[in-house]
Interface confidence: low
């Protein structure tokens, strides 16, 4: 099977491709002989053979024609040859050799047939990896050796090669002289031209140019080695927005696809509810009534405002109301749905409404609710209210359709009284305590009576006593002497009990005398 020549090799001489005689100079004439043959693919080739193994002191030279250097700095000589094993040739004693020598000479012009051994410089002694025996020869199994040598730097316009035989049985099947170039290539979307390497150990730095519809991400560079190899690329180009890498090029995104950013990612399919009709789109247009919020990435589907909340339920407790509702059937395709509560205080005619007082409180808040419940407190008693629950999402403000809300109307009840704030101890004795207090700040109606709850502190509320007082003072008797009691008082109106006051602690006297006018703790 024919092995193709690597693309980074440029031939200066290939004996296999020369038609007819090679016409190289052989000196002396009884040395190297040009003979026709065939290569491994049965293609006719010209070879040179010498096999003067019986004679002492062989010095047979073969010189190629003049080879122009072109742009080469370092050249490679590839020799294919067969070499006979001296042990397989009888009676040759010490005259047979299994090596030959390779030489070269640089010159600026063709010297023609003039030949001077001393002008040539030795490249190397060439030995065979595989030599053949007489038996191999009989079977025509000639072991073909390939040897490659480097020469350089070469500076003159051209050169000759020469082969010196010192007593071997050798057939020179092919001679190829080439130099290595780093071939044109596209790497990381940068084009690098054919580059001839330097001969020295240094690398040639080559700047790449970006392919069409791309731009430099980092300046693209590669190093061309002496071996004609492009070494690890540095930097790269990346396809512009609207273009993607396909077959070493940047090609436009097809309709229905887009690419928002410069870079080497692929074009992406337009997200749901968006489309594009042109080649090379950087983003996709939203369908009618669908939108993209400012912070939505181009990769996100276009979305729309949510539908109204559903199933609003109100739970009224005096001057508070808990509102619960269900999520909209359609969130518009977004996860950022929130709810706003619009509170309106209405007269007995539901159409005559005004915004609620700023004192009305919303728990956890009035706007931007993420859950489907809110508690509204500090409403006025016996008042009509309408609550509108708006469902909004990130694109609500971009759309022109009206607000998506659900409304519920309620009427508050009478509120219970607010807590008693302070309790004062008027007198104490061994077994009684007299207390007084002020009416709650917000009685929210006529106070019918007060509930006084007390217990021994050390009992920790496991057993307590409740008594009722019509006014704002009371004397509690049948207490233990020298004992701390905890007291709480709450007011009652027609709307029910208010919340308990905080806990107050008072102590009975240790003996029979009484103490008066002690303030609360």
């Amino acid at each position: 099977e024919l092995i193709p020549q690597p693309s980074n090799e440029v031939n200066l001489l290939d004996s296999k491709t020369i038609q007819g005689e090679l016409g190289w100079i052989s000196y002396p004439s009884h040395g190297w002989e040009e003979i026709s043959g065939v290569d491994e693919h049965y293609t006719p080739i010209r070879t040179y053979q010498v096999c003067n193994v019986m004679d002492h002191s062989q010095n047979n030279w073969l010189r190629t024609n003049w080879v122009p250097r072109n742009s080469a700095q370092k050249i490679y000589v590839e020799l294919k040859f067969t070499l006979r094993d001296c042990n397989s040739i009888p009676l040759v004693l010490g005259t047979c050799k299994e090596t030959f020598n390779l030489y070269y000479m640089e010159s600026d012009d063709d010297h023609g047939v003039k030949f001077r051994e001393h002008q040539f410089t030795k490249i190397d002694t060439i030995a065979a990896d595989e030599s053949f025996t007489q038996m191999d020869l009989g079977d025509r199994i000639l072991k073909l050796n390939t040897e490659i040598r480097e020469v350089g730097p070469v500076n003159k316009k051209g050169f000759y090669l020469a082969f010196q035989d010192v007593g071997a049985c050798v057939a020179l099947v092919s001679v190829r002289v080439y130099f290595k170039k780093c071939p044109f290539t596209v790497k990381n979307l940068a084009m690098f031209p054919d580059t001839v390497p330097m001969d020295s150990q240094s690398l040639v730095e080559v700047r790449g140019s970006c392919v069409n519809n791309s731009k430099e991400e980092d300046p693209p560079r590669m190093y061309c080695s002496t071996e004609g190899e492009w070494l690890v690329p540095i930097g790269k180009c990346s396809c512009n927005a609207g273009y993607e890498e396909r077959g070493f090029m940047c090609q436009a995104c097809r309709p229905g696809f887009y690419k928002a950013l410069d870079g080497n990612m692929k074009c992406a399919k337009c997200p749901p509810h968006s489309s594009t009709q042109e080649d090379g789109s950087m983003n996709c247009r939203c369908e009618n009534n669908y939108f993209r919020a400012d912070k939505d990435p181009p990769s996100m589907a276009c979305t729309r405002p949510p539908s109204s909340p559903r199933n609003v339920i109100s739970n009224i407790n005096e001057t508070s109301v808990i509102l619960d509702w269900s999520w909209p059937l359609d969130t518009g395709g977004r996860k950022d749905v929130t709810f706003n509560i619009i509170c309106k205080k209405c007269g007995w005619n539901i159409k005559q409404c005004e915004p609620c007082s700023p004192n009305v409180r919303f728990l956890p808040r009035q706007f931007g609710l993420t859950n489907t419940t809110v508690t509204v407190t500090d409403l006025l008693a016996h008042t009509n209210y309408t609550f509108e629950i708006d469902a909004v999402n990130g694109v609500s403000e971009l759309s022109s359709p009206p607000r998506q809300f659900a409304a519920v109307s309620i009427t508050t009840n009478q509120a219970a009284p607010s807590p008693v704030l302070t309790i004062k101890k008027d007198r104490t004795s061994r077994n009684s305590i007299s207390l007084s207090w002020q009416e709650p700040e917000h009685p929210n109606g006529i106070i019918l009576d007060y509930e006084v709850k007390y217990y021994e502190k050390q009992e920790q509320e496991t057993s307590y006593t409740i008594l009722r007082a019509r006014g704002t003072n009371v004397t509690i008797s049948s207490l233990k002497p020298d004992t701390i009691y905890v007291f709480q008082i709450r007011a009652r109106t027609a709307a029910g009990y208010g919340t308990n006051s905080r806990k107050f602690e008072f102590e009975t006297s240790p003996d029979s005398f009484s103490i008066s006018g002690e303030s609360s703790q």
Epitope: P6, S7, E9, Q201, T226, E227, E229
Partner: antibody
């Protein structure tokens, strides 16, 4: 005559940093690359990274975040710095010259290696 | 990363016989006419020594009884005839791309 010699601390505490110097002779650091390779006791060789003749570097991606290779051409010295050492970084650390002219990344001359033990 | 699998892990060969060590790459390490696969010899207490570079080129001062062959993903190191001084561990290494990686080694013992 080409010669490379590593010098290191021998013992490093866990989480500390390692600094090894490779001093070369017989060739110029501007013309050849130098590789760093390590070999835990009784185990395989692991390539850490290399510095080229022109000073550019290539690292093993597994260790890149912990590794830094630099050199001083005038002093013929190459430096390996590695941080956040753990016990599994215990190894013989070698510097080795790249074949140079051909840029094959074959290492034709090696130092004798310096033994690094990570232990508290 | 390219993984290099060496086989066998160890082998024992008689003096004068042939030792064959295989190295298989997880993907081709050949490119542009070269096979970027190298062989090293390491003896206990010593650094590795370059035997063969680019699959078949003998390193400096390496005896001709060492030879390398192969292309693509399959490579072989041959030693023939084996001599006493060849008892060592042999590693293959690729340089097709970074990171460079080594095989796990083959220990050659003499029978």
């Amino acid at each position: 005559q080409v010669h490379l010699k590593e010098s290191g601390p021998g013992l490093v505490a866990p989480s500390q940093s390692l600094s090894i110097t490779c001093t070369v002779s017989g060739f110029s650091l501007t013309g050849y690359g130098v590789n760093w390779i390590r070999q835990p006791p009784g185990k395989n060789l692991e390539w850490l990274g290399m510095i080229w003749g022109d000073g550019s570097t290539d690292y093993n991606s597994v260790l890149k975040s912990r590794l830094s290779i630099s050199k001083d051409n005038a002093k013929s010295q190459v430096f390996l710095e590695m941080n956040s050492l753990q016990t599994d970084d215990t190894a013989n650390y070698y510097c080795a010259r790249d074949r140079g002219i051909s840029y094959y990344y074959a290492m034709d001359y090696w130092g004798q290696g310096t033994s690094v033990t990570v232990s508290s | 990363d390219i993984v290099l699998t060496q086989s066998p892990a160890s082998l024992a060969v008689s003096l004068g016989q042939r030792a064959t060590i295989s190295c298989r790459a997880s993907k081709s390490v050949s490119a542009s006419g070269y096979s970027y696969l190298h062989w090293y010899q390491q003896k206990p207490g010593q650094p590795p020594k370059l035997l063969i570079f680019l699959a078949y080129n003998l390193g400096s001062g390496v005896p001709a009884r060492f030879s390398g062959s192969g292309a693509g993903t399959d490579f072989t190191l041959n030693i023939h005839p084996v001599e006493e001084e060849d008892a060592a561990t042999y590693y293959c290494q690729h340089s097709r791309e970074f990171p460079l990686t080594f095989g796990a080694g083959t220990k050659l013992e003499l029978k």
